[in-house]
């Protein structure tokens, strides 16, 4: 079987205050079993983002239908973009366990940094 | 619906220490980074600390840094405040309150702990 | 570090009538602000957020606008369990999460 992949094409991303930023991931594999999740930052001090699961996540939309059996886009779209938000995002994926799921595997990131201030 | 209830306030000396619980119920608390915000008596709002969801990122006032820490248990839905070498102008209600998202406003707010420093 | 400044300190109102609260900031927060309400004896309440959305559950009586430096909370006809402390609380910027100093609105 294939080995697990995560892509995250873009090493960085210039995002405009105030707009909206696709952040990309993709998988290489279904297997294991488990959820993507999406952080700001490494290591204990890194921020969740996003949690398909559980939380409510308002500034952020998925670009594809997660819930669909064979997905492997987990992108996501983060708006309203303030200067609080900048920092380098990880999609990492999760294998199911009991009583909590594992962190597998992290794309390799993408630093978010501000570009050209809004007209 | 969200509930958040502070304890552990009370009356200590100056030099003393006080530790500050929150229990919260009624959302994904481990989704959610968490704050404390003191209001001292006939004063506005002075925000205090931030945790991030994971527990693993910190940020502090810098009237309370090297003095007080934050922490939270994710399994007890628990936050938590230590507050050592307490000083007079200390003195004040102590609120716990949820954050919107991991960049944003508080959207729930505790009862409040009243916490006295006097000798 | 953006400094929140609220005027007037104390506003006086008859019930019926438009109060009209100001927050200004010493730099932009964009559309980052957010307004609370405090009444005597209990804990903050959140009214509006993104400087014109109101919370869930909040009559529409309460209005935000502005964006930038400066931001107006409205009570379009004020009743008198608006009698409170209003706070701004700006997130563009943090740490620190700052609030403004309050305005104390009064009932006539």
């Known amino acids: 079987e294939e080995e697990l992949q995560m892509i995250q094409p873009e090493k960085l991303l210039l995002v405009t205050v105030g707009k909206t930023a696709t952040l990309h991931c993709t998988v290489t594999s279904l297997l294991p079993v488990g959820p993507v999740l999406w952080f700001r930052g490494v290591g204990p001090g890194r921020e969740l983002i996003y949690n398909q699961k559980e939380g409510h996540f308002p500034r952020v939309t998925t670009v594809s239908d997660l819930t669909k059996r064979n997905n492997m886009d987990f992108s996501i779209r983060i708006s309203s973009i303030t200067p609080a938000d900048v920092g380098t995002y990880y999609c990492v994926k999760f294998r199911k366990g009991s009583p909590e799921n594992v962190e597998f595997k992290s794309g390799p990131g993408t630093e978010m940094a501000l570009g050209a201030k809004p007209s | 619906d969200v509930q958040l209830v502070e304890s552990g306030g009370g009356v200590v000396r100056p030099g003393e220490s006080l530790r500050l619980s929150c229990a919260a119920s009624?959302?994904?608390?481990?989704?959610?980074?968490m704050n404390w915000v003191r209001q001292a008596p006939g004063e506005g709002l002075e925000w205090v600390s931030r945790?991030?969801?994971?527990?693993?990122?910190?940020d502090y006032a810098e009237s309370v840094k090297g003095r007080f820490t934050i922490s939270r248990d994710n399994s007890e839905n628990t936050l938590y405040l230590q507050m050592n070498s307490l000083r007079a102008e200390d003195t004040a209600v102590y609120y716990c309150?949820?954050?919107?998202?991991?960049?944003?406003?508080?959207?729930?707010w505790g009862l409040g702990a009243l916490v006295t420093v006097s000798s | 570090e953006t400094v929140l400044t609220q005027s007037p300190a104390t506003l006086s109102v008859s019930p019926g009538e438009r109060a009209t609260l100001s927050c200004r900031a010493s730099?932009?927060?964009?559309?980052?602000l957010a307004w609370h309400q405090q009444k005597p004896g209990q804990a903050p309440r959140l009214l509006i957020y993104?400087?014109?959305r109101r919370a869930t559950g909040i009559p529409d009586r309460f209005s935000g606008s502005g964006s930038g430096t400066d931001f107006t909370l409205t009570i379009s006809s004020l009743q008198t369990e608006d009698s409170a402390v209003y706070y701004c609380?700006?997130?563009?910027?943090?740490?620190?999460?700052?609030f403004g100093g309050g305005t104390k609105v009064e009932i006539k």
């Open positions: 730099q932009t927060v964009g559309s980052k």
């Open positions: 309150a949820k954050q919107y998202d991991w960049n944003g406003f508080f959207d729930y």
């Open positions: 945790i991030n969801s994971g527990g693993g990122g910190t």
């Open positions: 993104d400087a014109s």
């Open positions: 609380q700006q997130y563009y910027y943090w740490p620190p999460y700052r």
């Open positions: 009624g959302f994904s608390f481990s989704s959610y980074a």
